[in-house]
């Protein structure tokens, strides 16, 4: 129960990638406003987005203090210019949020080929190691440093020819494959964490080709 | 429990079609990849293709290049193999196989079979 | 394509005998080697993993080993529920290809 015209949240929404995380809600308020606040399953809680018209709330500053501790999240809800009135039972209405582990369930940003080069019937392809806003030692951490080898990439590579996709897989940032001499190749690459049994695939990064000027070709 | 099962398979003439079934349970195919391997009467195993069904890349064995297709339905959670132009060597039990996708791990988890022959 | 010639293509052995089972890659496919165990009418079962990895649920008998390019299936001792085809593969490169296989029978 709650003030007459507030409404408690719902859908309450983890919206998570490379840890950037946002709690989303609805409804759209009405004559109402949020606040949210954020624990782990053994800490205190902590206010956010005071009093706030939005239906979401960037949490990032909180989870990336420990990523690998699981979260939750609620959502109160006041009637607006009374954020001091309470429910009938003394306390405003609020909903919990699902629980959240960022190290397990953050999605993969879209990873970025950062260059390639040739040399003969070799090709090194090299993945540009992403920041996130985790934090060690006041430095932002990157996608490899939270990960380490957890993070495997798939690449994906193809004659620019023919539509058939070979794969490699790498679990530092490079890649060395071989490629048919004269022939131009085109590259994607997926970024995977085999151990988790969910979101466990990035979206694949933007298509590079040789010939473009990515690209680094060196006749030995 | 992850389970792959595959159906579709039967006699067919030379030169005819038939489409494969892979139907995936306890888990999401978007998330891993899909492979189908065939088995020759007598004979041992080869790979044919495998699909990301995240992304819908492919690719197959020179065998069947040009021949056969894999697809994905992630609604359905299901993999295809759309085989044409049959011939009698294409004769085989068809498995697919989920890749788990690491750099250790290869195929974790097989189909029990279909059977498909090619024979007028 | 890489080729893995696998060896031999059929060995007789008793219950509590040692079996190695031996498969030799054409180039480096570093430790991108599986091998699986097939039963007549049946789909083939991960064995072993990253050349020398047992996979979950596998009994201890099995083992895996590398040097360099050659790669090896033992069985410490055979047991009853063992006769099979034993095939190896390598997914170092695309297209993954598999050994010829080996047949585990009774002497």
């Known amino acids: 129960s709650g003030t007459t015209n507030t409404v408690a949240a719902y859908n309450l929404t983890w919206k998570s990638t490379n840890f950037k995380t946002i709690l989303e809600w609805e409804p759209k308020p009405v004559n109402q406003v949020y606040t949210v606040q954020i624990s782990t399953k053994s800490g205190d809680w902590k206010s956010k987005c005071f009093y706030t018209t939005d239906t979401e709330c960037d949490l990032t500053d909180e989870i990336v203090k420990d990523v690998k501790q699981t979260y939750l999240a609620r959502v109160f809800s006041y009637p607006a210019g009374n954020v001091e009135s309470t429910g009938s039972a003394g306390e405003p209405l609020y909903e919990n949020s699902p629980e959240f582990t960022p190290y397990l369930e953050t999605n993969l940003g879209q990873p970025t080929i950062q260059s390639f080069e040739q040399v003969g019937t070799k090709v090194n392809v090299t993945v540009e190691d992403e920041r996130t806003l985790v934090r060690r030692n006041n430095t932002f951490l990157s996608l490899r440093d939270v990960f380490g080898k957890d993070l495997i990439y798939t690449l994906y590579y193809w004659k620019s020819s023919s539509s058939g996709k070979k794969t490699a897989k790498t679990n530092t940032n490079e890649f060395l494959i071989d490629v048919d001499k004269g022939e131009n190749y085109c590259f994607s690459v997926q970024a995977v964490i085999p151990s988790r049994t969910v979101n466990r695939k990035s979206t694949d990064s933007p298509v590079e080709c040789m010939g473009q000027e990515k690209g680094e070709f060196r006749e030995i | 429990e992850v389970q792959l099962v595959e159906s579709g398979g039967g006699l067919v003439q030379p030169g005819g079609s038939l489409r494969l079934s892979c139907a995936a349970s306890g888990f999401t195919i978007t998330d891993y990849w899909i492979h189908w391997v065939r088995q020759a009467p007598g004979k041992g195993l080869e790979w044919v293709g495998y699909i990301d069904p995240y992304n819908g890349y492919t690719y197959y064995a020179d065998s069947v290049k040009g021949r056969f297709t894999i697809s994905a339905d992630t609604s359905k959670n299901t993999a295809y193999l759309q085989m044409n132009s049959l011939r009698a060597e294409d004769t085989a039990v068809y498995y697919c196989a989920r890749d788990y996708g690491s750099l250790q791990v290869f195929i974790d988890y097989w189909g029990q079979g279909t059977l498909v022959t090619v024979s007028s | 394509d890489i080729q893995m010639t696998q060896s031999p293509s059929s060995l007789s052995a008793s219950v509590g005998d040692r079996v190695t089972i031996t498969c030799r890659a054409s180039q480096d496919v570093n430790t991108a080697v599986a091998w699986y165990q097939q039963k007549p009418g049946k789909a083939p079962k991960l064995l072993i993993y990253s050349a020398s990895f047992l996979y979950s649920g596998v009994p201890s008998r099995f083992s895996g080993s590398r040097s360099g390019t050659d790669f090896t299936l033992t069985i410490s001792s055979l047991q009853p529920e063992d006769f099979a085809t034993y095939y190896c593969?390598?997914?170092?490169?695309?297209?993954?290809?598999f050994g010829q296989g080996t047949k585990v029978e009774i002497k």
């Open positions: 593969q390598q997914h170092y490169t695309t297209p993954p290809t």
